[in-house]
Interface confidence: low
């Protein structure tokens, strides 16, 4: 069998909401993957498991099942959304993400994704990790790959 290539493209959008009482930030982060089937037979994308880390803490997980079938020598772009919560010991980020005098509210998130494909009863897992910058201060739609190159503004201590 030839390879199945998984390429993490980046963050497609991030939608933010806040809980005032809990000093909590909710970020729904939609990511984009390109999965290429280099074989002369179809493969099934059985599931995608993803998690997001902020400051070495897992802030969100997602799992998609029975996603799609990719035909021979074909490529499919797949979007998946990870709901994340920044709270509790990270509630200090609340000020950073909402204060007007901070213009760029980018935070560094580590995106981890594992794609499980199957063909002829054989299962294969491919994992990727990538650091991305996400604006936690407003709803943002990114051009593909854009979130990788933004400068991150660390909050003043």
């Amino acid at each position: 069998p030839r390879s199945i290539d998984v390429k993490y493209i980046g963050v497609k959008s991030a939608y933010v909401s806040y809980d005032v009482q809990k000093r909590t930030i909710y970020l729904n982060i939609t990511n984009t993957l390109n999965i290429t089937n280099n074989n002369y037979y179809s493969v099934e994308v059985e599931n995608i498991t993803a998690q997001v880390q902020f400051s070495k803490t897992v802030i969100g997980k997602a799992r998609l099942n029975n996603i799609t079938i990719i035909g021979p020598l074909d490529m499919k772009q797949i979007d998946y959304t990870v709901p994340t919560v920044i709270a509790e010991e990270m509630s200090y980020m609340y000020d950073f993400c909402t204060l007007i005098s901070i213009k760029v509210h980018n935070i560094v998130l580590m995106m981890q994704v594992t794609v499980t494909t199957t063909y002829f009863g054989h299962s294969e897992q491919i994992s990727q990790e990538r650091y991305q910058y996400v604006d936690c201060g407003r709803n943002t739609t990114y051009q593909l790959g854009q979130s990788e190159y933004l400068n991150v503004l660390q909050p003043q201590q």
Epitope: V20, C97, T98, L99, P155
Partner: antibody, heavy 118, light 112 residues
Amino acid sequence: QVQLQQPGAELVKFGASVKLSCKASGYTFTSFWMHWVKQRPGQGLEWIGNIDPSDSETHYSQKFKDKATLTVDRSSNTAYIQLSSLTSEDSAVYYCARSSNWDNFDYWGQGTTVTVSS
Amino acid sequence: DIVMTQASPSVSVTPGESVSISCRSSQSLLHVNGNTYLYWFLQRPGRSPRLLIYRMSNLASGVPDRFSGSGSGTAFTLRISRVEAEDVGVYYCMQHLQYPFSFGSGTKLEMK
């Protein structure tokens, strides 16, 4: 220690312009907003506007949009306010003050007294 | 624009007693993040303003704990307990929730 140094006084002619300076020291100049505040004799404080020295983004009070221009010189860690078409209404003490990305308006200059004479 | 109102131009107090200075805003200064973006400053005669309170109720560095701030989204109070002679001056509130930032007109504290 943090210091914002302003000249004590400026005497300027009616209709002229003046450029006031505020030299910052003791901290990273580009990490803090610089604000300018006006105080007429015996009156209260008025917020003129602020500038981010890192990229020169400015915000102005509508009242001062056509009167004041805020700039910075990063090489000398100095913020400036230029006041144009001066009248007696512009005779006042002008303070600079810094604030962090959070919100502490913690250091103020001593103020420059501008006197407009005819 | 947000308008800040300090209704009392001056208050008079006997040294050692307590005094409250009030301030109102034309709209709520409570941010979505739960903080209320109001400052209190003291300007002593012939001096630059000095930060006393930030985010409505937080004591600034080096300020005696005789000073305290409280309030709701639109009504704010600066309380000074055990007033001392050095507390005389003009007290200003200021909002920095949104641009343009704005000051109250000031309340002068005088000693009886």
